[in-house]
Amino acid sequence: KFSKQSWGLENEALIVRCPRQGKPSYTVDWYYSQTNKSIPTQERNRVFASGQLLKFLPAAVADSGIYTCIVRSPTFNRTGYANVTIYKKQSDCNVPDYLMYSTVSGSEKNSKIYCPTIDLYNWTAPLEWFKNCQALQGSRYRAHKSFLVIDNVMTEDAGDYTCKFIHNENGANYSVTATRSFTVKDEQGFSLFPVIGAPAQNEIKEVEIGKNANLTCSACFGKGTQFLAAVLWQLNGTKITDFGEPRIQQEEGQNQSFSNGLACLDMVLRIADVKEEDLLLQYDCLALNLHGLRRHTVRLSRKNPIDHHS
């Protein structure tokens, strides 16, 4: 369960994080599982442990194997396993599937390619980027922090992208490369001023005192991937989290749906055990993006009990 695959190339740096997390103050011990031999912490060793990180500087094919990390918390010793495979460098340009990180998709509006695992390393900009082994040149390509931005993405931009950077450890430099596939979604996206589908403006929602009630704020923002779009609820002009009523909560995370090709978001407001005072509040459904903000207001009213008398 707490196991993670890691891979790298011989003569490159490889840094692996323990699959078990912990507070920075927790001691982490590393072992080579096959021999149960402790991994040293002294940095003079080619392979050494540094807290939650296991460092191969540089890696060798013989380092392949399963490594055990034990995070010593105040209560339990929590165990994780890192399955490490170090491959020989390929002489040709092809990057085999087993060296590939997860595929990312982009479109004309959104074309960021993040360099995988880079956050584990001590590196300095700029990154070098390659596509199918060719160094990327031209004004369309911008290496920004830990990612590559491609302007005016075209279907021909799909392919395997490799980032290359230098890891520095105590003054010594080690090369690292990482490759992932990039696919282009063929979509003519656009964004427009938010359109709130629900609730209707100044809607009156009937609720029963003592029961639970759900209000859904649903809005569409355009077609395709939206750079910035959000829907949220406010109570009397205050964010739900700041309002401080634990019975009233926004659903964690925004549900994304594509209605007739449109990019839409919805956020559910859950009111537990509806009380009289909830009827006095103003409920605002807010939808915002780069074009601006739209607000629809809802009020609650008491649902009259059904009259069973004839």
Partner: antibody
């Protein structure tokens, strides 16, 4: 959503044992250690110990070590706390509780509703 | 075991006032957690890792401190804030709680 539902109130005689259950739902039971905390009437909170449901490993507060047994049934996602040789000072509300994110020990974010155990002759 | 001492034992304040609760530790700890408890209810996590606000907790609650002295502050008391507050350490076993501070209406 995460829920910890405990068994009902118990009345026991001194010297007897009590076994309180805590049924977990809304998350993967074996991914989180479960803790037991008690509170005597009008008193503060006291940590009794914890169990890792995946392995069955336990860590007990030394104060209770001789009398407490914590177990977990993976098939029903239920944890149990048994306290033996009961005495009147064991009268308390017993809570099961869980951290928000296990590996970071970031406080008890989820609590059972509590089980009142009364020890009286 | 690590002993946590909370002061004052009782704090009498009016709504709108600022509340400052202290937790003193017998030996240095890295983090402190804070809970609120109302009569007949289970405790509720307010602040974790000394200063981080737990989910759904209003911003008027804040935590600070390091080493052996930690503080919970309620910037402006609301009627629902009158309760008992506990600090708790997770630095070493056994995990321990402070004796509690009761915040009552003046």
């Amino acid at each position: 959503q995460v829920q910890l539902v405990q068994s009902g109130a118990e009345v026991k005689k001194p010297g007897a044992s009590v076994k309180v259950s805590c049924k977990a739902s809304g998350y993967t039971f074996t991914d989180y250690e479960l803790h037991w905390v008690r509170q005597a009437p009008g008193q503060g909170l006291e940590w009794m110990g914890t169990i890792d449901p995946e392995t069955g490993d336990t860590v007990y507060n030394q104060k209770f070590k001789a009398r407490v047994t914590m177990t977990a049934d993976k098939s029903t996602s239920t944890a149990y706390m048994e306290l033996s040789s009961l005495r009147s000072e064991d009268t308390a509300v017993y809570y099961c509780t869980r951290a928000f994110y296990n590996d970071y020990d970031d406080g008890f974010a989820y609590w059972g509703q509590g089980t009142l155990v009364t020890v009286s002759s | 075991e690590i002993v946590l001492t909370q002061s004052p034992a009782t704090l009498s304040l009016s709504p709108g006032e600022r509340a400052t609760l202290s937790c003193s530790v017998s030996s240095s700890v890295s983090y402190m957690h804070w809970y609120q408890q109302k009569p007949g209810q289970a405790p509720r996590l307010l602040i974790y890792d000394t200063s981080k606000l737990a989910s759904g907790i209003p911003a008027r609650f804040s935590g600070s401190g390091s080493g052996t002295d930690f503080t919970l502050t309620i910037s402006s008391l609301e009627p629902e804030d009158f309760a008992v507050y506990y600090c708790q350490q997770w630095n070493s076993s056994p995990l321990t709680f402070g004796g509690g501070t009761k915040v009552e209406i003046k």
